[in-house]
């Protein structure tokens, strides 16, 4: 409860912010988890404190670890924990899948890539964007804030997008770079009333008390780019991001073409360490589009533990 | 968005026990903040009653101590109130509230209760 | 109990005027570099509203007309321009130790 996971690269600068915020002005102490030593507050310091934010200035692999953040009031301390994680730079073109950020989707009538995290640096435009390693040349690519716009977006478009800018900290410059997979949506197609591949409706699925469990959510919504076409889950008849149990979340998948065309999309709901109550909620998988909606609904029972006859 | 109602009986008599429950919406209440009760006698002004915090912990106004119970119904995401051996005095609109660090952030619209015979 | 006195107990401004109410506690509300005071807003048949958070911190969507200053025991709340719809009872509240208290409210009238 209360943890997230930030990653970034050795010698780049990678600035987390406390997962468990209070509002701007409150005092935050920051801890290095494994020792309980203090994170200084002097910026002279290679990583140090600066309210809500933890900042790496820049990163080195040994940084790697569990912080800890206690916002602090007389009458409410509020903790919070930042998973970091600090990976030395690839010599080759690869980014590997744990530095990528969330898949983006795009077709011609929006091809939004957004820099992720970027609003937690000191930055000034222009941003660099690269794909596939190479640097965006062309005017159909327009770096515009902290996003980038594709003109007349093609299938060829698809692939990894990398942004670049630089952070400034007290006068001193310092690299951030930041990855993310674009995919394209065909516009060619039709669609159609969707239809829910999984979870069959009225499942029982099987849990541990304790231990983490995943529900997916599929669906196909016709052929070629879907002009509006979503998953979701829903807790109890309200969205997770309103239902507010941070160990429930969902995830969004990467869209999915079957072999036979058909355009689908996942949202996996992750549940860690899984409680009693959870199995009293009602977990239902909606598919919509501009046909209608479709809703399957999911009920969690305790798994038995299996008996061991000789 | 956090939305809080309160419901529960208006009217109480002497000696008895005031009872009201706060249904939250938007929020669960084992997530985070705590989860007030706050109380003011017509034409005066606000008073805490006590709170529940998200982990279950309990903090109460030492001068209603005696007489106050908080507790909450995490499946129906309820948190509830119960001041014992009410007098005339008890009789205010009974306000439930969310703090999210030291302020009381969210409140719901409040609810009269009298205390007659 | 940290007791919080406000004053005055009501007073009536003329828009476009400034409005000041002030608050004492009974001790300071002041610790690391915080003051752990607040205002609220509350008009008729209406819950309280936030407006100042940490003695000076505007709470979000709130106008920039209110302002709050203040450390230790003496905290101000300004209204300035004062509006009509400013027509409310003001509360401070701290929040240094447990149990957290009120003032007991300061009714502002417009002219």
């Known amino acids: 409860k209360f943890s997230k996971q930030s990653w970034g690269l050795e010698n780049e600068a990678l600035i987390v912010r406390c997962p468990r915020q209070g509002k701007p002005s409150y005092t935050v102490d920051w801890y290095y988890s494994q020792t309980n030593k203090s994170i200084p507050t002097q910026e002279r310091n290679r990583v140090f404190a600066s309210g809500q934010l933890l900042k790496f200035l820049p990163a080195a692999v040994a940084d790697s670890g569990i912080y800890t953040c206690i916002v602090r009031s007389p009458t409410f301390n509020r903790t919070g924990y930042a998973n970091v994680t600090i990976y030395k730079k690839q010599s080759d073109c690869n980014v590997p899948d744990y530095l990528m950020y969330s898949t983006v989707s795009g077709s011609e009538k929006n091809s939004k890539i957004y820099c992720p995290t970027i609003d937690l640096y000191n930055w000034t435009a222009p941003l660099e964007w690269f794909k596939n390693c190479q640097a965006l040349q062309g005017s159909r690519y327009r770096a515009h804030k902290s996003f980038l716009v594709i003109d007349n977006v093609m299938t060829e478009d698809a692939g990894d997008y990398t942004c670049k800018f630089i952070h400034n900290e007290n006068g001193a410059n310092y690299s951030v770079t930041a990855t993310r997979s674009f995919t394209v949506k065909d516009e060619q197609g039709f669609s159609l009333f969707p239809v829910i591949g999984a979870p069959a409706q009225n499942e029982i699925k099987e849990v541990e008390i304790g231990k983490n469990a995943n529900l997916t959510c599929s669906a196909c919504f016709g052929k070629g780019t879907q002009f509006l076409a979503a998953v979701l889950w829903q807790l109890n008849g309200t969205k997770i991001t309103d239902f507010g149990e941070p160990r429930i979340q969902q995830e969004e998948g990467q869209n999915q073409s079957f072999s036979n065309g058909l355009a689908c999309l996942d949202m996996v709901l992750r549940i860690a360490d899984v409680k009693e109550e959870d199995l009293l909620l009602q977990y239902d998988c909606l598919a919509l589009n501009l046909h209608g909606l479709r809703r399957h609904t999911v009920r969690l029972s305790r798994k038995n533990p299996i008996d061991h006859h000789s | 968005q956090v939305q809080l109602q309160e419901s529960g009986p208006g009217l109480v008599k002497p000696s008895q026990t005031l009872s009201l429950t706060c249904t939250v919406s938007?929020?669960?209440?084992?997530?985070?903040?705590?989860w007030d009760w706050i109380r003011q006698p017509p034409g005066k002004g606000l008073e805490w009653i006590g709170y529940?915090?998200?982990?279950?912990?309990?903090y109460y106004n030492p001068s209603l101590k005696s007489r106050v119970t908080i507790s909450r119904d995490t499946s129906k995401n309820q948190f509830s109130l119960k001041l014992s051996s009410v007098t005339a005095a008890d009789t205010a609109v009974y306000y439930c509230?969310?703090?999210?660090?030291?302020?009381?952030?969210?409140w719901g619209q409040g609810t009269l209760v009298t205390v007659s015979s | 109990d940290i007791v919080l006195t406000q004053s005055p107990a009501s007073l009536a401004v003329s828009p476009g005027q400034r409005a000041t109410i002030t608050c004492r506690a009974s001790?300071?509300?002041?610790?690391?570099?915080?003051?752990?005071m607040h205002w609220y807003q509350q008009k008729p048949g209406q819950p309280p509203k936030l407006l100042i958070y940490?003695?000076?911190n505007l709470e979000s969507g709130v106008p920039a007309r209110f302002s709050g200053s203040g450390s230790g025991t003496d905290f101000t709340l300004t209204i300035n321009p004062v509006e009509a719809n400013d027509t409310a009872n003001y509360y401070c509240?701290?929040?240094?130790?447990?149990?957290?208290?009120f003032g007991q409210g300061t009714k502002l009238e417009i002219k």
């Open positions: 509230a969310t703090t999210m660090m030291d302020t009381m952030d969210y």
């Open positions: 938007g929020y669960s209440i084992t997530s985070d903040y705590a």
């Open positions: 529940i915090r998200y982990s279950g912990d309990t």
């Open positions: 001790k300071s509300v002041s610790t690391s570099g915080n003051s752990y």
């Open positions: 940490l003695a000076s």
């Open positions: 509240q701290h929040s240094r130790e447990f149990p957290l208290t």
